[in-house]
Interface confidence: low
């Protein structure tokens, strides 16, 4: 495993007596059952601690909640529970933070038994707050526009759609019956609505609808529709096709006026499509396999969201609305990490640097042995436990973590073998962006990454003991420190650190409880004077990312173009700071095969880099729709990937030529594209975006 | 439509052997875990063991390794449940399901066969 | 092995009354857990897997919540035709286990 506490470690001086300086205790009196912890704005210091107690007595539930407020990074926290009246506030969806650092906090009030709900709202970082009543009884939390944090989105629990022009002090009602609602871009709102009344049953006939003035006019931008999401610039729906129970994948890129069938297999009833990620170049999708199977394909877009190659087989997702592992690795450009289910009924994890373009194993660690698993001791692979193993009740405290201003690091659960173990895992790190990893830490830990990577903590889960030590290391996982930061161990429920990973605080959060007693308890550990000095130009060193053949003049080049970076030396013991910017150095590369991705009517025999013609449409005229236009295509098949920068070697030309003819899709379109004043619809019915949590972009 | 049709009741004497079969229909029987789950009279579910018949790979409880085992035969789609020697307290219903998930033992037992009762008496 | 226990053993229940049964497993299973119901001389049928996913053409009175260690099972308004035994079942690890089960007459 790697270097403890011993000679190849630089231990940090006098560490104890500095942290336990910076060491802050808050004792919450009070019993509640669950704590939730909200960040307000960046770089404020100002946390919002919510804790609630529910009971249920006979057919209703009894609750009470305390509002804590810190305004150091957690180091003190003051009961604000007054300034909202002593008020029950929802823990589900009850606090709602405004985006960038507008200082906008709503609270949803739990107003049993009544019609309306009620709302507490502050516009300077939870200081002061104004009730204010609702018209209705939200189902989820209140909705921000990205673009204007004065307007709010609700949906009821009639299915009712609500919005607010003045941060929830007036509500109007825009719609009935609708299932699903979303902000897209420039305070734009996208609905589907059904009036038959039901969300549930009837999903393939529901109508998507827009509004680009809050309401006051709609128009109808689909029908026959069973689900719809945003990703990246683009806009999805999932529709009946006429034929049977098969629906498909429409997209749109200007926000619905026009759209185009993505060139994705339909899928039945038993089966869905889910938006793994998405930016504004190319979106990655799944689709699940016909049957039961809890795997399907992955395929990436192309800058259109129309062409699709497949990326990943037997990609595994389990039941609908169940689990991937799919992750997104920010902290280096093009990584992904992902399972497939093997063709023994084994989990694999699998890798890819180049934005799904080739998929490989994840290189063993050198300094683990392959697991009794392994059929060939000496070959055998790492394997990442995520949202997969979490849901299938392993230890795994933790999902994968990785920050874009801490380039390159990458810290995760996993096992060494021939594909994922059952035994408890161990920490592992990376600190190429998943190129190479090292056993970091054993046993499952909580952990998170300090001042944009400058510092790692970690606390080992413990579930039948208390905990009373904290881990750091300065070197990105190579060494650890020990401390102590209680005497008497607390039982351990997680750590809270500002999100962006620029801070140098972290919370210990946990209970403490007796016989007659139970109360939380928060250690806000500052790591201020173990970084002592801000860091220098000497501190840092240039590292080439994605580099794997230092011989090669194309060594480093992903998607047309490489990026040296300026990084810290593990050595360096110093403060990158809160305004720490990433410096990089992005150079050109030349075009190859590899930087274009087949276009329509064209694939790519394994192991080959070569586009050729799906026999079946050799020699026929391309013809397809897009945008509502049919276009006649003239390709040797190749178009460019998305986001690559290549210039020079290789470029075979493409051509469009438009037949501007109209060909729009009758199962999205209306008989007549329809457009109305404010109006609305009885029934009742719901329907709830299930991903958004797990960063899916978009599920069915 | 996914069928599983069990064979029929059984009456033994203690010592006796016993193999009860489960057919399955409508669906790709290889991709499929078959479990076996017994019910003593008047009590509840017990899960005994499954196995994956594309490749036989078989998990037990604890509580009926080496008591049963599980088998299956994927040439005419059917998994069997066998005892070497009874004992009365093998006196039982014994049901066949399958698995909601194809290809891997998470999940729930989605089609039940009609059970096929087990009477073991001197 | 995960061990699961139900509560209640029995009740006797009045139609349209609301019945919550629960299942507490012994460590963490996610939401690998599911329910079934079975009738007098019947095989058990699924009626919610993964805690909260209703099985296709289970009336819509039965949804099923939790997560983690506590999981329960919500018979909206009871119709006479629910009279039955209820059990749940984890598949988080094996063995699987089912708890005991929950025993729901019409009084």
């Known amino acids: 495993s790697a270097p403890g506490e011993d000679e190849e470690c630089g231990r940090v001086r006098d560490f104890v007596a500095k942290l336990a300086n910076n060491t802050h205790q808050h004792i919450f009196n009070d019993l509640s059952g669950s704590v939730s912890l909200s960040w307000v704005g960046d770089s404020t210091g100002v946390i919002l601690v919510l804790t609630t107690f529910q009971v249920p007595i006979f057919m209703i539930t009894i609750g009470q909640s305390k509002l804590y407020r810190s305004e150091d990074y957690g180091k003190n926290f003051k009961d604000i529970t007054d300034l909202i009246n002593n008020t029950f506030i929802r823990s589900d969806f009850g606090i709602a933070i405004g985006p960038e650092n507008s200082g906008k906090v709503v609270l949803t009030a739990d107003v049993s038994g009544s019609h309306g709900s009620r709302i507490f709202r502050s516009s300077d970082f939870a200081k002061n707050f104004v009730q204010q009543e609702l018209p209705f009884v939200p189902l989820m939390q209140i909705m921000y526009s990205p673009q204007n944090s004065d307007y709010l989105l609700a949906l009821s629990n009639k299915n009712e759609l609500w919005v607010s022009k003045n941060f929830g002090g007036k509500w109007e009602k825009l719609y009935d019956t609708v299932c699903l609602a979303k902000w897209g871009s420039d305070n734009t709102i996208f609905f589907t609505a059904n009036h038959n009344g039901s969300c549930s049953n009837d999903r393939g006939m529901l109508e998507l609808w827009r509004t680009s003035d809050l309401g006051k006019s709609f128009k109808t931008i689909g029908s026959k529709i069973y689900s719809f999401g945003l990703g990246g610039r683009f806009l999805f729906a999932s529709v009946m096709t006429g034929k049977g129970t098969l629906r498909a994948i429409h997209v749109s890129t200007d926000q619905g006026d026009t759209w185009s069938m993505a060139q994705l297999p339909p899928v039945g009833h038993e089966q869905f499509y889910s938006i793994l990620a998405a930016n504004d170049d190319m979106v990655f999708m799944h689709v699940d396999e016909p049957g039961d199977s809890g795997f399907g394909t992955i395929f990436t877009s192309d800058d259109r969201g129309i062409v699709y190659s497949k990326s990943l087989e037997r990609h595994l997702y389990t039941t609908t609305g169940g689990e991937t592992d799919f992750t997104n690795v920010t902290s280096l450009r093009g990584v992904y990490i992902t399972s497939i289910l093997a063709e023994d009924k084994s989990v694999q994890s699998m890798i890819t640097f180049d934005q799904g373009g080739r998929w490989t194993h994840l290189r063993k660690p050198e300094n683990s042995k392959c697991d009794a698993t392994a059929r060939d001791p000496e070959k055998c692979s790492l394997h990442i436990h995520a949202a997969y193993s979490i849901a299938t009740g392993l230890n795994v405290p933790m999902l994968p973590l990785s920050e874009p201003n801490a380039v390159g690091i990458v810290i995760a659960h996993g096992s060494v073998g021939d594909a994922i173990s059952v035994m408890r895992p161990d920490v592992y790190i990376s600190d190429d962006g998943g190129y190479s990893w090292t056993k970091a830490l054993e046993g499952p830990h909580h952990y998170t990454i300090l001042d944009s990577g400058g510092i790692i903590v970690a606390v080992e889960q413990n579930a039948h003991q208390g905990v009373n030590q904290i881990k750091f290391s300065t070197d990105e996982g190579q060494c650890w420190q020990t401390y102590n930061f209680t005497k008497d161990p607390i039982f351990f429920t997680g750590l809270a650190s500002e999100p962006g990973a620029r801070s140098m605080n972290i919370s210990i959060w946990g209970y403490r409880s007796s016989l007659f007693h139970q109360y939380w308890i928060s250690y806000t550990i500052d790591f201020k004077d173990i970084l002592e000095r801000n860091c220098e130009e000497k501190d840092y060193t240039i590292w080439l990312a994605h580099s794997t053949d230092p011989e090669d003049y194309e060594d480093g080049c992903i998607l047309g173009y490489k990026e040296q970076f300026l990084r810290l030396r593990k050595s360096s013991v110093c403060q990158n700071g809160r305004d720490y910017v990433v410096t990089k150095q992005p150079s050109i590369c030349l075009c190859s095969l590899e930087d274009f991705l087949c276009d329509f009517g064209y694939y790519r025999p394994e192991n080959d880099s070569k586009c050729v013609e799906q026999p079946e449409l050799k020699g026929h005229d391309l013809e397809f729709c897009l945008y509502g236009r049919e276009e006649h295509l003239t390709t040797n098949g190749y178009r460019k990937i998305p986001g690559d920068k290549c210039q020079g070697g290789v470029n075979p030309v493409r051509e469009v030529k438009d037949l501007k003819k109209k060909c729009t899709s009758n199962f999205l379109s209306p008989e007549k594209q329809n457009s109305k004043s404010n109006g609305s619809a009885g029934g009742s019915g719901g329907l709830n975006d299930i991903f958004e949590a797990q960063k899916i972009e978009w599920h069915e | 439509e996914v069928q599983l049709v069990q064979s029929g009741a059984e009456v033994k004497k203690p010592g006796e052997s016993l193999k009860i079969s489960c057919k399955g229909s409508g669906y790709i029987f290889t991709s499929f875990w078959i479990g076996w789950v017994r019910q003593m009279p008047g009590k509840g579910l017990e899960w005994m063991g499954i196995i994956y018949p594309g490749d036989s790979d078989t998990r037990y409880s604890p509580s009926f390794q080496g008591q049963v085992t599980i088998s299956a035969d994927k040439s005419i789609s059917t998994a069997y449940l066998q005892w070497s020697s009874l004992k009365a307290s093998d006196t039982a219903m014994y049901y066949c399901a399958r698995h909601s998930r194809g290809s891997f033992w998470y999940g729930a037992f989605q089609h039940w066969g009609q059970g096929t009762l087990v009477t073991v008496s001197s | 092995e995960i061990v699961l226990t139900q509560s209640p053993d029995f009740q006797s229940v009045t139609p349209k009354e609301k019945v919550t049964i629960t299942c507490r497993a012994s460590?963490?299973?996610?939401?690998?857990l599911h329910w079934y119901q079975q009738k007098p001389d019947q095989s058990p049928k699924l009626l919610i897997k993964?805690?909260?996913q209703s099985f296709s053409g289970v009336p819509s009175r039965f949804s099923g919540s939790g997560s983690g260690t506590d999981f329960t099972l919500t018979i909206n308004s009871l119709e006479a035709e629910d009279a039955a035994a209820y059990y749940c079942h984890q598949s988080s690890s094996l063995p699987h286990t089912f708890g005991p089960g929950t025993k729901v007459d019409i009084k």
């Open positions: 460590q963490s299973i996610g939401s690998s």
């Open positions: 993964y805690a909260s």
